[in-house]
């Protein structure tokens, strides 16, 4: 019997300072570019080496970005989301959702809060 794959979803506020080459990541998603089935949310698809996001270290590929400077990213066209980031200013606050894959055994698996493996 195979183990079950579960996901641990957490949210985090990430404050980035725009670097010389910008924020340093790519996005996918939007109402006209659904990257995840039945979800028009905005996701991080690429973290650029030595960019602001990479140097900060918290934003990860696969993260869902929920808001930028308090502005919700729900129901946006892809290009509108891109423009929102580009016009977000020097100090940018991102509310992000991390989705961590947790491999659980078929029986008697430990809870996710148990640090012992």
């Amino acid at each position: 019997m195979n183990g079950r794959v579960d996901y641990l979803v957490t949210e985090e506020e990430i404050n980035l300072t725009r670097g010389p080459s910008g924020l340093g990541f790519n996005i996918v998603g939007g109402t006209d570019q659904q990257y995840v089935s039945n979800d028009s949310g905005i996701y991080v698809s690429r973290i650029k080496e030595n960019g602001a996001a990479a140097l900060d270290g918290r934003l990860q590929e696969g993260d869902k970005i929920l808001s930028v400077n308090g502005q919700d990213l729900k129901n946006l066209l892809h290009q509108d989301a891109v423009d929102l980031f580009r016009n977000a200013g020097y100090a940018v606050s991102l509310r992000v959702q991390h989705r961590l894959q947790v491999q659980n055994g078929p029986i008697g698996h430990r809870g996710e809060g148990d640090p012992s493996g």
Epitope: S21, G22, L23, G24, F25, N26, I27, V28, D32, Q33, Y35, V44, S45, R46, K48, E49, G51, H78, Q79, V82, F85, R86
Partner: nanobody, 129 residues
Framework: QVQLVESGGGLVQAGGSLRLSCADA??????????MGWFRQAPGKEREFVAH????????YYADSVKGRFTISRDNAKNTMYLQMNSLKPEDTAVYYC?????????????????????WGQGTQVTVS
């Protein structure tokens, strides 16, 4: 995983035309999220930017040397990008590479920077005599 394969290169006389294709043999439905470009490299020279296209084809950008002669396009239903090359010149002789990055940069476009792209094809030779 992304697997870009170019085709359509060959030998053509000056003034002639060629159409290059770049297909992703592996992506499936994610192709439509790629930002893509064409680059070329002539013997003894550095890799040179040729053209760029955004995810849905609504935004294109060209090097000055090919503007008005080359046209970049894409068909997301076929997982393929194209480069229509007209009025070819001997100086267009090079190996042509397609490149892709997943998603759109949230920063100012730097289409011509190879570091903006994560995935590259193996190249197709274009020779203009």
């Amino acid at each position: 995983q992304v697997q870009l394969v170019e085709s359509g290169g060959g030998l053509v006389q000056a003034g002639g035309s060629l159409r290059l294709s770049c297909a992703d043999a592996a992506s499936g439905r994610t192709f439509s999220t790629y930002t893509m470009g064409w680059f070329r490299q002539a013997p003894g020279k550095e890799r040179e930017f040729v053209a760029h296209i955004n995810w849905d084809g609504s935004n294109t950008y060209y090097a000055d040397s090919v503007k008005g002669r080359f046209t970049i396009s894409r068909d997301n239903a076929k997982n393929t990008m194209y480069l229509q090359m007209n009025s070819l010149k001997p100086e267009d002789t090079a190996v042509y590479y397609c490149a892709a990055a997943i998603g759109s940069t949230v920063d100012s476009y730097r289409h011509s920077d190879p570091l903006e792209y994560d995935y590259w094809g193996q190249g197709t030779q274009v020779t203009v005599s």
